[in-house]
């Protein structure tokens, strides 16, 4: 425990001290006091440097003194023979004796008292920056007017921090400007403007005089500007060394003025103002800015419009323009958006046609649609060439964005029919000669494909079976062949309204309006063995004359068999109706006069016994198109006859073209349109 005073005596004092002794005393007085140690008696064996016996006084790491020998007071009024004054509150006294004493020595008597120290004067380092005040047991620092004592209780500074400037314009100066600024101060000024405005600082060279840098170039007093993560300065010296206009690019600025204890100058004065935060005029390719300005600042809004053929894609939505706002951080909103070339995407595929994979699907690219020739052609024109337009659509000069339509080429057989090995009444044929030929298996009959969805046949073929099974693409109707061919599934059968339905069809004598249409569930794919026949035109060019030749085909009865295995065909001339009337009906089911002959019927045959027969019904009587010799049209449909191998009667298709077209239009599907 610290004490204010005390006594220290050598061992056995006042008797002689023993040999070989080492003893120490730790003196401690309260904080803020020094120690006054004085000896009133000293009788210790004398030796050079007190090497044998000694009393040693140590303060910290410093030896304050080492004593031996005899001393007596010089002052008759004072008993003190030796004294020490230390400005510290701790002291150590160490007594040592060696192994022998030539005489009898009595040692020492000493006393210590706590004494006040003057911190203001007793030390090399002055404890206070300005005024030092001593008192018993301590000291305190004080400051001149307008200064305040810092938290360390030693340093004085001016109260120059804490000011926050929020006005859009202002002036700030160092304390006492233009008088010398206070030493040993740290002044912090804060400028806080509304977001979207940047602080711009302006100084004049002559308004700045701050203690210059040392030889190493370090400012002793300094002015620093801090804006976010950017720093301007430190600045010092005579005349402002930095830029006279500082654009901080921030709405918040901290000004820090740091001074040391020496070298005060007049200081500095600055002006600041808030500029709306500028946003850079960015180069956004393929676009136009509206309004166009030399400089854009906070809250400015521009509309960025893409040039034709370019679009801004955000998510999955494409737009031709977007708005961008100059934000408070000096950056444009929507800055990620860019005008990219319009992408028309992979072109849609078309039925029965193709489009080459484009090298590019971007604005300006060109693609070409083609139809699967020679079985399909482009119905709606336009040449099939499309370019990627500015609106993101593939556009054709004629059709616009409408896709081309590939429709079957009609009436063109892949191989022309030639009457080769002669068979009585007809020839073997290949389905490629008559690709429109449709086979009905129940009843055994024929039909003619007129487009992807429709089969034309005789009414008497379908009147008893409204769900006929049909096949296309096979020359042979053997089971193994039909299994490989295309089976057609009917959706609906349309019998001509003029066809009279009978309770006993076997006794029919009236075959007027013997025509029907079968709508298919699925479109037929055309190719070398499957292709439609054309319909007759409505002009007089399509009026048949006696002697005009037509082709018939089918799997009907031949001389040898009831049903042909392979397709048979014959070339027949048109004959006057009376020729058909004159032939005696082979197995009449009624009086010969009861059989009806009308202008809706064509009579043909009579040459070399070539004729259609049972099982050929519904097949086409195909005549060369008068306006296009490469094509055939269905002039007639095998209907009935008085006797096989003579003349036959065919439904005159030209008389039914309007009904055919109307029925097909009224019963088309959106897919077909």
């Amino acid at each position: 425990e610290p004490t204010m005073y005390g006594e220290i005596l050598s061992p056995n004092y006042p008797q002689a001290y023993p040999s070989e002794v080492e003893k120490s005393w730790d003196i401690e007085v309260p904080e803020g006091y020094g120690i006054h140690l004085y000896f009133t008696h000293l009788d210790i064996e004398l030796s050079e440097n007190c090497a044998y016996d000694s009393v040693q006084i140590i303060s910290g790491d410093t030896e304050e003194g080492r004593l031996c020998g005899q001393r007596s007071s010089n002052n008759p009024h004072s008993p003190i023979v030796e004294e020490f004054q230390v400005p510290y509150n701790k002291l150590q006294v160490i007594f040592k004796s060696d192994f022998s004493n030539e005489e009898r020595f009595t040692g020492f008597a000493a006393y210590y008292v706590a004494t006040d120290i003057n911190e203001c004067t007793d030390f090399v380092d002055v404890p206070c920056s300005h005024f030092c005040n001593n008192f018993i047991g301590g000291y305190f620092c004080s400051c001149p007017p307008e200064y305040f004592l810092h938290d360390d209780m030693k340093n004085c500074g001016v109260n120059c921090s804490g000011d926050v400037f929020t006005a859009l314009i202002g002036e700030i100066a160092s304390p006492n400007y233009p008088k010398p600024y206070p030493e040993n101060s740290r002044c912090e000024y804060q400028i806080r403007l509304e977001k979207g405005f940047q602080v711009v600082v302006t100084l004049r060279r002559e308004d700045f005089d701050v203690e210059a840098a040392d030889s190493a170039g370090n400012c002793l007093d300094s002015l620093v500007f801090v804006a976010g993560d950017r720093q301007f300065g430190p600045y010092c010296g005579h005349g402002f060394p930095g830029p006279l206009n500082i654009e901080t690019k921030s709405n918040a600025l901290d000004i820090i003025f740091q001074t040391d204890l020496t070298g005060q100058k007049k200081g500095w004065k600055l002006r600041y103002h808030g500029d709306p935060m500028p946003c850079p005029k960015e180069d956004t390719p393929n676009s136009v800015w509206e309004p166009a300005k030399a400089k854009y600042v906070f809250r400015d809004v521009v509309q960025i419009t893409c040039l034709d053929g370019f679009e801004v894609v955000e998510g999955r939505v494409g737009a031709t323009s977007f708005y961008s706002t100059c934000q408070s951080n000096g950056k444009w909103s929507n800055s990620k958006l860019k005008c990219q070339p319009v992408d028309c995407g992979i072109p849609e595929s078309i039925e029965n046609g193709k489009v080459e994979d484009p090298e590019s699907t971007l604005f300006g690219s060109v693609i070409r649609y083609t139809c699967e020739e020679p079985y399909y052609y482009m119905e709606n024109g336009g040449g099939g060439e499309y370019h990627c337009a500015g609106n993101g659509s593939w556009v054709n000069e004629v059709l616009g964005p409408e896709l081309p339509k590939c429709v079957p080429v009609c009436g063109v057989p892949r191989e022309p029919f030639e009457e080769k090995q002669r068979i009585i009444g007809g020839s073997d044929a290949d389905i490629k000669n008559f690709p429109w030929q449709v086979f009905f298996d129940n009843p055994w009959a024929g039909g003619a494909l007129i487009n992807e969805y429709w089969v034309l046949t005789a009414a008497h073929v379908v009147e008893g079976n409204r769900e006929p099974t049909m096949y296309v693409g096979s020359t042979s109707v053997q089971t193994s062949r039909l299994a490989k061919s295309k089976m057609l599934t009917p959706e609906h059968v349309f019998i001509h309204p003029g066809w009279k339905l009978l309770e006993v069809p076997e006794g029919r004598t009236n075959f007027d309006n013997d025509i029907a249409l079968v709508r298919l569930k699925d479109p037929v794919k055309m190719g070398p063995t499957v292709s439609p026949i054309c319909l007759p035109g409505t002009s007089s060019d399509y009026n048949l004359m006696d002697g005009d030749l037509g082709l018939i085909s089918g799997w009907g009865r031949t001389e040898k068999r009831d049903r042909a295995v392979r397709l048979k065909a014959a070339r027949l001339p048109v004959a006057p109706l009376r020729k058909c009337k004159e032939v005696k009906v082979e197995k009449p089911t009624a009086d010969a006069e009861a059989y009806v002959f009308t202008p809706n019927m064509i009579c043909a045959g009579g040459e070399k016994g070539m004729d259609s027969c049972k099982g050929d019904s519904g097949g086409a009587f195909a005549v060369q198109d008068p306006n296009d010799k490469t094509k055939f049209y269905a002039a007639g449909l095998v209907s009935w006859g008085p006797q096989c191998g003579t003349y036959g009667l065919y439904t005159r298709v030209k008389n039914y073209v309007d009904w055919i077209m109307k029925t097909m239009q009224e019963n088309s599907t959106p897919r077909e349109d």
């Epitope: 042979s476 089971t479 193994s480 039909l482 299994a483």
Partner: antibody, heavy 119, light 107 residues
Framework: QVQLVQSGAEVKKPGASVKVSCKVS????????MHWVRQAPGKGLEWMGT????????IYAQKFQGRVTMTEDTSTDTAYMELSSLRSEDTAVYYC????????????WGQGTLVTVSS | DIQMTQSPSTLSASVGDRVTITCRAS??????LAWYQQKPGKAPKLLIY???SLESGVPSRFSGSGSGTEFTLTISSLQPDDFATYYC?????????FGQGTKVEIK
């Protein structure tokens, strides 16, 4: 009326060959597709092959490939089926059959020829 | 090759019973399937063609159904003349394979 008349029964030793004929009457062979079917005693029916006039090729069942040969003589309207490397399991009644039309598998069947393979 | 699997192999039934025989194809054969009846020592007789079409002259108690891979032959009321072996056959593509047969015998 179409008829198929087959050659008579045969007895053959293992490893030998047999050639069965089938004569068409009432029609021409060129108009028909001839198939061959066999049936071992107490066993099921096995399709052996046919001549496909459309493709102009003979199609053999995988099981008989390499051992069977089917030929036609259109001048006599006769079809032939030759089976070589005979083994006891080839003992069967062999039928020639004409292919039917429009879904009918077989139209006319021959009376069958019994081939017995025995050592 | 398309495999045809018939079930059951043997079926014991009485006169007047309703009998169903199943035929399964290893892949789709659409409707290209035929059913035959065969009696000992005789050539097979066609009953049904194109899966469901009845051959002319065949009694209406015989009927066929199915398409794709699953087919059935039904005899609505078994008659004494119907005890025989029945075969299915696919004619969709070569090889024209037969089922292994179903023997219908008197219970």
């Amino acid at each position: 009326q179409v008829q198929l008349v087959q050659s008579g029964a045969e007895v053959k030793k293992p490893g030998a060959s047999v050639k069965v004929s089938c004569k068409v009457s009432g029609d021409t062979l060129t108009e028909l597709s001839m198939h061959w079917v066999r049936q071992a005693p107490g066993k099921g029916l096995e399709w052996m092959g046919t001549f496909d006039p459309e493709e102009g090729e003979t199609i053999y069942a995988q099981k008989f490939q390499g051992r069977v040969t089917m030929t036609e003589d259109t001048s006599t309207d006769t079809a032939y089926m030759e089976l070589s490397s005979l083994r006891s399991e080839d003992t069967a009644v062999y039928y020639c059959v004409t292919e039917g039309l429009a879904g009918f598998p077989f139209d006319i069947w021959g009376q069958g020829t019994l081939v017995t393979v025995s050592s | 090759d398309i495999q045809m699997t018939q079930s059951p192999s043997t079926l014991s039934a009485s006169v007047g019973d309703r009998v169903t025989i199943t035929c399964r194809a290893s892949q789709s054969i659409s409707s290209w399937l035929a059913w035959y009846q065969q009696k000992p020592g005789k050539a097979p007789k066609l009953l049904i063609y194109k899966a469901s079409s009845l051959e002319s002259g065949v009694p209406s108690r015989f009927s066929g159904s199915g398409s794709g891979t699953e087919f059935t032959l039904t005899i609505s009321s078994l008659q004494p003349d119907d005890f025989a072996t029945y075969y299915c056959q696919q004619v969709n593509s070569y090889d024209w394979t037969f089922g292994q047969g179903t023997k219908v015998e008197i219970k």
